[in-house]
Structure formats: C-alpha cells, structure tokens
Interface confidence: medium
Amino acid sequence: KLTIESTPFNVAEGKEVLLLVHNLPQHLFGYSWYKGERVDGNRQIIGYVIGTQQATPGPAYSGREIIYPNASLLIQNIIQNDTGFYTLHVIKSDLVNEEATGQFRVYPELPKPSISSNNSKPVEDKDAVAFTCEPETQDATYLWWVNNQSLPVSPRLQLSNGNRTLTLFNVTRNDSASYKCETQNPVSARRSDSVILNVLYGPDTPTISPSDTYYRPGANLSLSCYAASNPPAQYSWLINGTFQQSTQELFIPNITVNNSGSYTCHANNSVTGCNRTTVKTIIVTELSPVVAKPQIKASKTTVTGDKDSVNLTCSTNDTGISIRWFFKNQSLPSSERMKLSQGNITLSINPVKREDAGTYWCEVFNPISKNQSDPIMLNVNYNALPQENLINVDEQLYFQGGSGLNDIFEAQKIEWHEARAHHHHHH
C-alpha cells in the first residue's frame, strides 16, 4: 500500500522536511503533490512527468518544494503555515490513480525566554512574588528551575497560566535564590538567564558577643552586635537606656565597676521598617575569673557500715566562692544522715550506710567560673554479715541483698537536692 512518512514529523520553522514515499507502484506515468487531505487542483504544489523528468509547479507551489524522481517531496525553509496534511496523487501508466496522505507539524524554533517579576523587592512573610516566563508561545511547555533544581513541592508555590507564571506566596528569606524558566516544544528547548530573588527581611533579634557577663576592673570591654537582615541592619548602642553611638561594635577601654549595667543593642532595617533590640547585663567585679582546683580530705576512706561516721572536707584557697558536693553525679546532701557545715566545706555522714559507698567530689564556684576536685572513693564494710546473705561463687564470697536490702551497686537511685552555701575564707 502506498504510504507517506514525514521525516521528521515535528519540524522546526526554518528547517526542512522530507515527505518520503513508500511502496510506490511500478509503471507510472507521473505524480502530483497537493496541500491538504484530498486532490484539489487549486492546491496542487507540484507535478512530475516521469517520461520527461520534468517538474511542473502548481498554484500552491512556493519555490521551497522539490520533488524527487521517486516521488518524495522535500520542503525547505519551513513556515508555520506548512503544518498539516499533504496528499500524493499517483497516475499509473494504465491511468488508474492511487492516493496517499501524510502530515507533519511545524513548531517555532523557540527564542530564549526571559523572566519578568511583579515585585523586585519583596518583604519576608508579607509579600508575594509572581514570576512570568516571556514570551507567551503557542504549544510551548513551561518549566521552572530554582538553583538549577526542579521546583520543590510547597504550598507557597503556585503555577498558573499554563505553568507560565510562578507565584511565591509569603516569601521567606529561604526563597532568595536563582530562578530560571525553560520553554520547550517538540523541536527545541531554551532556558532563560537567572533572575535572583532578593527577599528583604529582618532584622532578627540581635546577638551580642562575646557572651561573657563578668569582667574585671581594668579590662577592655569590646562588644559586637549582629542581627540577620537584608539589607544589613544599622546598629546603635545604649547603656542603661542612654544612647551611646551608632556602630556595630562598642569599645570601652579600662572599665571600672561603674561600667556595670545593661547594654542594649538596637538593630534597624530602614527598608523593612523593622527594628529589634537585645539587652545584655555586664558586671564588673574583683571576683577571680579562675577558680583553683579544690582538694578533698577524708577522715577515713574505709568505714564500717551502720557504725562509723565520716567527714569529707573540700579545701580551697579562693575567696568569694561557693561549694557544692556530688556523689555518683548527684548533688548532696541526699539523706538525713548527711550534713553540710562550715559553709559547705565539710560533708559529714553519720552513720555511714552501705548505700553511701562510692565516688565523692566537690566543686567550688563563683559567678565567673568553677572548678572540681578529683574524686575520692569511700568504701563501706560490714563486719558480721548474716550467713544466708553470702553466696559462694568460684570460691569468692558475694553479699546478696536480703531482708529488704538493695544491692550495693543499685543503692543510689534517689533524686538529690542541691544545697548551696557561701563560704568566705580569710587569710
């Protein structure tokens, strides 16, 4: 059967297409091509007589069509109007006619698209931005890219207008990115240049650094303020509510106790119209910024349970410090049998019980720093244990909790309460 194959089927404007004829009959007189799905003399493109090898143009001939001796038709410099059906009319030597129809589609070679925006300076959590991919092109598919990735799924992103428009609702600073649009049709794909979305935001709550609160007299006070903001924030400093200067850094040399007070950083974004403040307390004090490591002294480290008492003493030479005690990572005292005295210097346990065995340490601290002692181990023995509480395993004697006693290693499961006292040691 006579058939027509279009090569290619989708043709770009300005390119060429070949209507290839298959199964052309033998013994032909000639053939003619027509625009459309039927033979119509007014729409004849070209005729060809085999005997003379002569091609004759018809009313629909444009000068861009060329017929081959094998009846195939080449159309050059394709235009949009060429899209559609083409009919080949074959005249055999016995004057019996045969027809076949083929078709192709014409698409424009897409121009490089560009992005237009309805808002070049959107404000975070307030504005929406609509990007539109230009120009509008018939039969084109529109795609969007964010930082060269396909669009993320988000309820704040909406495609409309046949995907030609991308709207970002309630923009956030995270929407600040490179946006591109791409147009595609069956014959071409073009991507736009990047458009950078510049979302205005902030200032966020400022951060004052360093985080130190305590300073010694004679030190230099150097504070820096930063708040995330676009455009960058303008900064000003207030001390105890009084304006000082409009800078991001505040520097006061050789401070005294009179420089103690509240330091306020004020950050302002004149474009978003927002401002935020942070207040920091600065204390200038003679207190030691480094506390020496204390030492524990024990009246005994091995005691007899339910009989002996023990005193643990935390020794330090620092002044203006406080002391706290720890047993098995819990703060003390933890029972009626434990007493703190001499401003927490001494921990007394009377009487010592099995559950008191373990590791103790003390910590000395002031408002500026702290330090811990090395741990000390308290061992608790029992002279006479009831026979039923001893188990012989591999010729070793182990104590087994009985009569409501807990295993020595499981004894301490109480939530401890912290006791804090202040001790002033005078040399």
């Epitope: 300005g14 060429e16 000068g63 060329i66 050059q76």
Partner: nanobody, 119 residues
C-alpha cells in the same frame, strides 16, 4: 507562473571570466535554495554551486572552489554565478534550478545558457 531564465553565457578564452544571471519569477528566491547545474556531453550532470538565502549558506563543488562565486540579489529576485579562471573542462550548458539545501536533488530547469571555454 514559476520561471527561471538564465543568461550571460558565451565564448571565452581559458583563464577568462563570465557572469551568469538567473532571473526568477513566480516565487521568492529568498525563501529557497538556488543552484547552478551544468551538463556537458559525455559527462555526468554536476551541481557546481548553490545559495540558500534563508539560511545564509553557500556551497561549491570541489571542481570550481576558489574560482566560482554564487550570489543573489533578492531585490531583483536574481541569482548570479561569477566564473573566473575558466578552463576548457568548464565548457557546458549551465542551468539555474531550485535545489535542496541538504539533498542532491533539483527541479525546474530554465532553458539553460551555454558556456564555451576555448582558445
């Protein structure tokens, strides 16, 4: 009506020059490709040069490269073939034709113009 009319042929000595013209009617030469085809007795038909105005391209047979130049004047709807350094083997009837940009096929001969290179 589509017509291609050639002119400019004649007798010229070896090394001489001629300029052939092809006046087109019934279509715009800017929309298609125009070529010069030559036929000589005992030789194969040869497409010597072509110009595609819409594409901005020209192409030449190896045998004439550097000697022949094809051009077109769209305002006159006319194509030209400037032939320099002519040789005896360039003797032939030269036809103007509509040709395929990328295909070895051409239609619509004019009546042709004869070029004879002889001393």
């Amino acid at each position: 009506e589509v017509q291609l009319v050639e002119s400019g042929g004649g007798l010229v000595q070896p090394g001489g020059s001629l300029r052939l013209s092809c006046a087109a009617s019934g279509f715009n030469i800017k929309d298609t490709c125009i070529g010069w085809v030559r036929r000589a007795p005992g030789k194969e038909e040869e497409l010597v040069a072509q110009i595609c105005q819409y594409h901005g391209s020209t192409r030449y047979a190896d045998s004439v490269k550097g000697r022949f130049t094809i051009s077109a004047d769209t305002s006159k709807n006319t194509a030209y073939l400037q032939m320099n350094s002519l040789r005896a083997e360039d003797t032939a009837v030269y036809y103007c034709a509509i040709v395929g940009q990328n295909y070895p096929v051409y239609n619509y001969w004019g009546q042709g113009t004869t070029v004879t290179v002889s001393s």
